[in-house]
């Protein structure tokens, strides 16, 4: 039975040209995290294997930086970066947990961080 929950940075906004940290945290389970995948819509941005470390897609390596921790930093943001991002935790023996973050990249300086929320 999967008992864990993923806490994420929720709905967030950031300024065009700036950077943002996407962060997820898995709690309430003793399952071993074997890998975390970061995805944007239908694209795989990066993976972080518990043993082998980070592997960033060449398509994004200029604008994606690993960390902090299991999080992902997006740099040089453009309006096209607006959308859904997913952290996918592969665990043993539980299976897969998925967290969702919505990022809005704004033209102006009115960007504010949204509240944290949980996905069971």
């Amino acid at each position: 039975m999967m008992t864990g929950t993923i806490e994420t940075t929720g709905n967030i906004s950031a300024e065009k040209g700036g950077s943002i940290i996407l962060q997820c945290h898995l709690s309430s389970t003793t399952a071993q995290v074997t890998q975390v995948n970061w995805e944007q819509q239908d694209q795989l941005l990066a993976i972080c294997n518990a043993d082998l470390g980070w592997h960033i897609s060449p398509s994004f390596k200029d604008r994606v930086a690993p960390g902090p921790g299991l999080g992902l930093t997006l740099q040089s943001l453009t309006v096209n970066d607006t959308g859904e991002y997913f952290c996918i935790y592969h665990t043993y023996p539980d299976g897969t947990y998925t967290g969702r973050i919505f990022l809005e990249v704004l033209e102006s300086s009115v960007a504010e961080h949204g509240a944290r929320f949980q996905i069971p």
Epitope: Q43, L44, G53, S57
Partner: antibody, heavy 114, light 107 residues
């Protein structure tokens, strides 16, 4: 030049033990996760074990859990695979592999037979 | 575990031919796929990673494509030194798994 040189293979009886070693050079060993991948005669590839750069985390294939242990000594630039309770189906060439499988050693042959 | 199925299991082609090898994943793996070349009696060598990125030093006649569940390795003009067995591998989720291999021979 990246080099991975495996040793320690040989002929062993079922139930026996072997310890494989992999001497690494040409890169900063302590910065890379490492793996052991095996290939049974005439067969495909199977990931057997992985270990974090610091050695603090390891993962083993279900087929070897409880029998094999992966470890490393970063001061010696060496990766190990301790194989206990060996079975005939463990007969294979064992490869030492760097990181996300970008460099492979030449392999060492393990034969389990009575 | 994710199953990786390669086809064909073997093929024979003439020097200069265009050769295509396919790899199918049992579930969506996005672009988390690598291709390896193993020449007879040698260890595997990384050719392609992230489905389409050539490893440094790999000849341009080798190319990879695909996303999701269906992937292709293409040798645009087969050379005698390309005689080998080719394997795909997924690293979308653990345990990482390999395809069964495709043996390429020269007619």
């Amino acid at each position: 030049e990246v080099q991975l040189v495996e040793s320690g293979g040989g002929l062993v009886q079922p139930g026996g033990s072997l310890r494989l070693s992999c001497a690494a050079s040409g890169f900063t060993f302590s910065s890379y996760g490492m793996s052991w991948v095996r290939q049974a005669p005439g067969k495909g590839l199977e990931l057997v074990a992985t270990i974090k750069s610091s050695g603090g985390s390891t993962n083993l294939a279900d087929s070897v859990k409880g029998r094999f242990t992966i470890s490393r000594d970063n001061s010696k630039n060496t990766l190990y695979l301790q194989m206990n309770s060996l079975r005939a189906e463990d007969t294979a060439v064992y490869y030492c592999v760097r990181g996300y499988f970008d460099y492979w050693g030449q392999g060492t042959t393990v034969t389990v037979s009575s | 575990d994710i199953q990786m199925t390669q086809s064909p299991s073997s093929l024979s082609a003439s020097v200069g031919d265009r050769v295509t090898i396919t790899c199918r994943a049992s579930q969506d793996i996005k672009t988390a796929l690598a291709w390896y070349q193993q020449k007879p009696g040698k260890s595997p060598k990384l050719l392609i990673y992230w489905a389409s990125t050539r490893q440094s030093g790999v000849p341009s006649r080798f190319s990879g494509s695909g996303s999701g569940t269906d992937f292709t390795l293409t040798i645009s003009s087969l050379q005698p030194e390309d005689v080998a067995t080719y394997y795909c591998q997924q690293y979308y989720s653990t345990p990482y798994t390999f395809g069964g291999g495709t043996k390429v021979e020269i007619k």
